[in-house]
């Protein structure tokens, strides 16, 4: 039998064992988080699958993910939301220690999809393990990009109190308007619920005394946030290694001096 013709995309294909991975992650998450015990993981997988299976992978909409978003509804306590941009690993290390703060990937839907790739094909029930659309080279309305845009928007919309964001001080654009944080989350914080955004600018491994809160891109972020009637604060984290160490052991005498 000749293999059926399959669309060739520029991006890597669906992560191997994708359905099993999503289902296993869901089961694990609901076991660890008592408030999500009511979630039926088979229904979650069905809703996830329904968002992209049999659909042309360059024509996915936020609407496609609404059934999944509904099943994964979760709230973060006020003052406990941590957003991040281009510095995922440190943000996750932080919330692993500071257990009462949450990134999107600490929530069910973010946890399910973190580091995974997926896409289907128009008019077939197959998952494409060979290739998926690349955001730049193929299209932006692909299953993965639309998923993260959808859940990031929701995560920002539900945030309240003081929201924190971790930004990478080693990038040329510390705040990048084209990142998910800059293009989605910033614009979906609700001024009636969010009093302030506090940016933590994480310095690279090299020692430095410069105040990166004075960076032009941070000033741009401040301007965007202030125009939305949300207060803005910025802190330099000069020593990320010490920062994490002091989150773990705040009583440590060396934590009285700067981080």
């Amino acid at each position: 039998v000749l293999p059926r013709w399959r669309q060739q995309w520029s991006g890597s294909g669906t992560t191997s064992r994708f359905p099993e991975t999503v289902l296993a992650r869901c089961v694990k998450y609901t076991e660890v988080h008592p408030e999500m015990r009511h979630v039926d993981c088979q229904s979650v997988w069905d809703a996830f699958k329904g968002a992209f299976i049999s659909k042309y992978p360059c024509n996915i909409t936020e609407e496609d993910y609404q059934p999944l978003v509904k099943l994964g509804t979760q709230t973060v306590p006020c003052n406990k939301t941590l957003l991040w941009s281009r510095i995922k690993d440190l943000a996750h290390q932080f919330t692993q220690v500071q257990r009462d703060m949450f990134t999107l990937e600490d929530m069910l839907l973010g946890y399910l999809a973190d580091d995974l790739t997926w896409c289907g094909e128009f008019n077939t029930f197959e998952i494409n393990y060979q290739s998926c659309p690349d955001w730049r080279k193929d299209c932006s309305n692909n299953p993965v990009s639309v998923f993260w845009k959808t859940v990031s928007r929701r995560f920002a919309e539900t945030a309240c109190g003081v929201v924190h964001v971790m930004l990478n001080g080693s990038r040329s654009k510390i705040f990048d308007k084209n990142s998910t944080f800059g293009s989605v989350e910033v614009h979906n914080l609700q001024p009636e619920k969010v009093q302030a955004l506090e940016a933590w600018v994480i310095h690279g491994g090299r020692e430095d005394s410069r105040d990166l809160c004075q960076d032009p891109t941070i000033k741009e972020l401040e301007s965007i946030i202030s125009k939305r009637n949300i207060r803005f604060f910025c802190k330099n984290i000069y020593r990320p290694d010490k920062f994490l160490q002091c989150v773990k052991n705040p009583e440590d005498s060396s934590c009285l001096s700067g981080i």
Partner: antibody
């Protein structure tokens, strides 16, 4: 040994511009080390103009020099540049480039470029 | 901007003597990252400055141990335990705790 080599002296008339260069012979550290420019005027001591981190092009200027100086760097030739505009006699000085040795510490200095502005 | 004030302006010393130069900043140089970015440079006639001491008390590579630095907050001192002929020149303190980096006016070390 010479680590930073600066361009030769420049004589300019008021109102003109000049672009000074500073070649770093340590190609490994150049992209990821801030390069500062400092000027020394007789009787005025040293003034920090600004610095640039070549690999990402991040620049800090001293407030006094924001409209006077333009910093640039080329990571292919490992060369930093300082352009001075609207020159006046007040800008006559020796201009040094200095690469940081550790974070925020000027450890290695070029030999300096004398800029003389005269009608 | 932080103002760095050095004293004395001129310091005549005999070879083998101890020399002491003071540097005072207009505000504390203790940075929020826990470091104090106060440094000392020597500029010999016709040459560019050379780093001697960084972050108050650390000798830069190749700097003889007769040079030492001390101080905290706003008051700092450079000591040369036994002055040699090659030590003559102008000594500058500098801070890089707060932008813009600023420099002291210099202290000229000369033979008595």
């Amino acid at each position: 040994q010479v680590q930073l080599q600066q361009s030769v002296s420049e004589l300019r008339s008021p109102g003109s511009s000049v672009k000074l260069s500073c070649k770093d012979f340590d190609s490994e550290v150049f992209p990821t080390s801030y390069m500062s420019w400092v000027r020394q005027k007789p009787g005025h001591g040293f003034e920090w103009i600004g610095d640039i981190l070549p690999n990402i092009g991040r620049i800090f200027y001293g407030e006094k020099f924001e409209d006077k100086a333009k910093l640039d760097a080329d990571t292919v030739s490992n060369t930093a540049y300082l352009e001075l505009t609207s020159l006046s006699s007040e800008d006559s000085a020796i201009y040094y480039c200095a690469r940081e040795a550790y974070g925020s510490i000027l450890g290695y200095w070029g030999q300096g470029t004398l800029v003389a502005v005269s009608a | 901007d932080i103002v760095m004030t050095q004293t004395p302006l001129s310091l005549p010393v005999g070879l083998g003597d101890q020399a002491s130069i003071s540097c005072r900043s207009s505000q504390s140089l203790l940075h929020s990252n826990g470091n104090t970015y106060l440094h000392w440079y020597l500029q010999k006639p016709g040459q560019s400055p050379k780093l001697l001491i960084y972050k108050v008390s650390n000798r830069f590579s190749g700097v003889p141990d007769r040079f030492s630095g001390s101080g905290s907050g706003t008051d700092f001192t450079l000591k040369i335990s036994r002055v040699e002929a090659e030590d003559l020149g102008v000594y500058f303190c500098s801070q890089s705790s707060h932008l813009p980096w600023t420099f002291g006016g210099g202290t000229k070390l000369e033979i008595k």
